[in-house]
């Protein structure tokens, strides 16, 4: 449906309270290191010229794109070219090249300080002195730092956050009750941003074909009993909204949310049983509760799909009639039947039976082709669930540090050109599966492991995309989404690696390790043990345990020493020394 | 295709527990239902109790609460554990398996008496 202004039309299906928070989010997330106060500016301008449109549709420039007047309003940045470099080389491109523009210089790794947690009253106070001000900041410093976070999501957030300072601020504990409630915004944040990392990399690199299939297979596992028309459709509406997120257009993407959500919430019967709790909900948390529900049951005695996809006579004339549409269903039946799966492993199945009918109707006998097709999927599926259950029995065995430590390890070894602070960052996510997911039933294990697994090492692909130094990292990330995972866990030791040479000033520590947190000793310790791999790749695991023991005796005593930096400066060379004699 | 074999079954006394354990061999990696059905005699084969791929479980109304359906994928193993056993659960009970890619599988069934 065409309006008159697009502009006006937004700001009146979102209201100008979500209207302004989008705008603020879009600004920031494509201008990250613009200061608070020019977005709040920006933003302001924007919703007066908003609010003359929807006083007067005809008026003086209201008929433009969106895109046309943000990306203007962003080229009256004075400092676009000293901050931001050839990014302004943007506003001399035509729409929608210019939006094209800014979208490929959003920076996933921006040099931005890290989020500092100032003390609690002071927090109070700037939350009660301008709790508007306070909110915006709050959505600023989020989507400048993850420039495609799911901005409709975003305000829920903001709302929660809101939320907690409301009740916190007034209670008694002011420290007890908020620190914990930041820590799970902060701790939900990041997954949720990475997960929708995910979304748009699966769209902007490899297609809509690639985030529908996604779509088909997990909405399949969600809603089993709905029909697959239903199901299509579903798909169709999600795959607007990402793809409107991920391409900058925050307002429709909002906007189309919404109707999304009314339509599930209108068409409850036809989809799951699961979403009435939700759709009692005010718009951002019902929204949110839709997207996070539970599988509904599955229905009972679902038949066997070798009759339509093995047996049948028809199965090549119905793959030629639709490909996509035969694969559809092929995939939705599989998906609704196993919830115990990841949608990565349904992909997997999905493209392996298309491989198979794409030689077989091709062949002389068809049918005698691809009457066993199913026997290739027994390797695909066991795979996953030994792995799963083999990471997990390290997971138990050694504790999340340690089992973070052997990731290290592992990955070093595989790609030892990639940054040692990607390293560290991949790893030690990778590592957090396993508290995330071993101790959930066995038929959840799967799905929660290796689609997890599939968000974290695409931050490693978007990461190493920005700076690119190893051809393998290259090829895992874009030879198939689907099989990333599996491509990454094949790599073994590279043998062309040149050792890193020994550099003492990356072992020389001193006091300031006493005052870091628990996490950051973690850290720190961990970007040694990459640099001991990066200089001996081929160090077994006991070398290395041997190593990293010492190193943890050693900055133990330090820390407890009188004169803490006299210490490390004595032990701190004479444990260089041995450690270069235990890798030798 | 999957193979089923039950066991576990017997003589109990009302009030009383059994285990019944079903093996599954075969194809196991194409289940995605697990259920347990029973047939007294002159009677029909009733569902008692089912689980699926995802872990989500259903009882039949005479057995909620009395009733605890699990399975072990890595075993591939279904149990039923029957506790407050009540003459009118006297049946031979078989074990069922839905598969993906393969007809549904039975077992051949174990007996289930209860009785003073």
């Known amino acids: 449906d065409t309006h008159k202004s697009e502009v006006a039309h937004r700001f009146k299906d979102l209201g100008e309270e979500h209207f302004k928070g989008l705008v603020l989010v879009a600004f920031s997330q494509y201008l990250q290191q613009c200061p608070f106060e020019e977005h709040v500016k920006l933003v302001n301008e924007v919703t007066e010229f908003a609010k003359t449109c929807v006083a007067d549709e005809s008026a003086e420039n209201c008929d433009k794109s969106l895109h046309t007047l943000f990306g203007d309003k962003l080229c009256t940045v004075a400092t676009l070219r000293e901050t931001y470099g050839e990014m302004a080389d943007c506003c001399a491109k035509q729409e929608p090249e210019r939006n094209e523009c800014f979208l490929q210089h959003k920076d996933d790794n921006p040099n931005l300080p890290p989020l500092v947690r100032p003390e609690v009253d002071v927090m109070c106070t700037a939350f009660h002195d301008n709790e508007a001000t306070f909110l915006k900041k709050y959505l600023y410093e989020v989507a400048r730092r993850h420039p495609y976070f799911y901005a409709p999501e975003l305000l829920f957030f903001a709302a929660r956050y809101k939320a907690a300072f409301a009740e916190c601020c007034q209670a008694a504990d002011k420290a007890a009750c908020l620190l914990p409630k930041l820590d799970e915004l902060r701790d939900e944040g990041k997954a949720s941003s990475a997960k929708q990392r995910l979304k748009c990399a699966s769209l902007q690199k490899f297609g809509d074909r690639a985030f529908k299939a996604w779509a088909v297979a997990r909405l399949s596992q969600k809603f089993p009993k709905a029909e697959f028309a239903e199901v299509s459709k579903l798909v169709t509406d999600l795959t607007k909204v990402h793809t409107e997120c991920c391409h900058g257009d925050l307002l429709e993407c909002a906007d189309d949310r919404a109707d999304l959500a009314k339509y599930m919430c209108e068409n409850q019967d036809s989809i799951s049983s699961k979403l009435k709790e939700c759709c009692d909900k005010p718009l951002l948390e019902k929204s949110h509760c839709l997207a996070e529900v539970e599988n509904d049951e599955m229905p009972a005695d679902l038949p066997s799909l070798a009759a339509d996809y093995v047996e049948s006579k028809d199965v090549c004339k119905n793959y030629a009639e639709a490909k996509d549409v035969f694969l559809g269903m092929f995939l939705y039946e599989y998906a609704r039947r196993h919830p115990d799966y990841s949608v990565m492993l349904l992909l997997r199945l999905a493209k392996a039976y298309e491989a198979t009918l794409e030689k077989c109707c091709a062949a002389a006998d068809p049918h005698e082709c691809y009457a066993k097709v199913f026997d290739e999927f027994q390797p695909l599926v066991e795979e996953p669930q030994n792995l799963v259950k083999q990471n997990c029995e390290l997971f138990e065995q050694l504790g999340e540090y340690k089992f973070q430590n052997a990731l290290l390890v592992r990955y070093t070894k595989k790609v030892p050109q990639v940054s040692t602070p990607t390293l560290v960052e991949v790893s030690r996510n990778l590592g957090k599966v396993g508290a995330k997911c071993c101790k959930l039933p066995e038929a959840k294990r799967m799905p929660c492991a290796e689609d997890y697994l599939s968000v974290v090492l695409n931050r490693l692909c978007v990461l190493h995309e920005k700076t690119p130094v190893s051809e393998k990292v290259t090829k895992c990330c874009t030879e198939s989404l689907v099989n990333r995972r599996p491509c990454f866990s094949a790599l073994e030791l590279d043998e062309a690696y040149v050792p890193k040479a020994f550099n003492a000033e990356t072992f020389t520590f001193h006091a300031d390790m006493c005052t870091l947190s628990e996490k950051e000793k973690q850290v720190k310790k961990q970007t040694a043990l990459v640099e001991l791999v990066k200089h001996k790749p081929k160090a077994t695991k006991e070398q290395l345990k041997g190593v990293m023991d010492n190193f943890a005796a050693f900055v133990e005593k330090c820390c407890k020493a009188d004169d803490k930096e006299a210490c490390f400066a004595e032990e701190g060379p004479k444990f260089v020394a041995a450690s270069q004699a235990a890798l030798a | 295709q999957v193979q089923l074999v039950e066991s576990g079954g017997g003589l109990v006394q009302p009030g009383g527990s059994l285990r019944l354990s079903c093996a599954a061999s075969?194809?196991?990696?194409?289940?995605?239902?697990l259920a347990w059905y029973r047939q007294a005699p002159g009677k029909q084969r009733d569902l008692v109790a089912r689980i699926s791929s995802g872990g989500s479980t259903h009882y039949a109304d005479s057995v909620k609460g009395r009733f605890t359906v699990s399975r072990d994928n890595a075993e591939n193993t279904l149990v039923l554990q029957m506790n407050s056993l009540k003459p009118e659960d006297t049946a031979v009970y078989y074990c069922?398996?839905?598969?993906?890619?393969?007809?549904?599988?039975w077992g051949q069934g174990t007996q289930v008496t209860v009785s003073s």
């Open positions: 069922y398996a839905q598969s993906t890619w393969y007809p549904p599988s």
């Open positions: 075969g194809s196991t990696w194409s289940i995605n239902t």
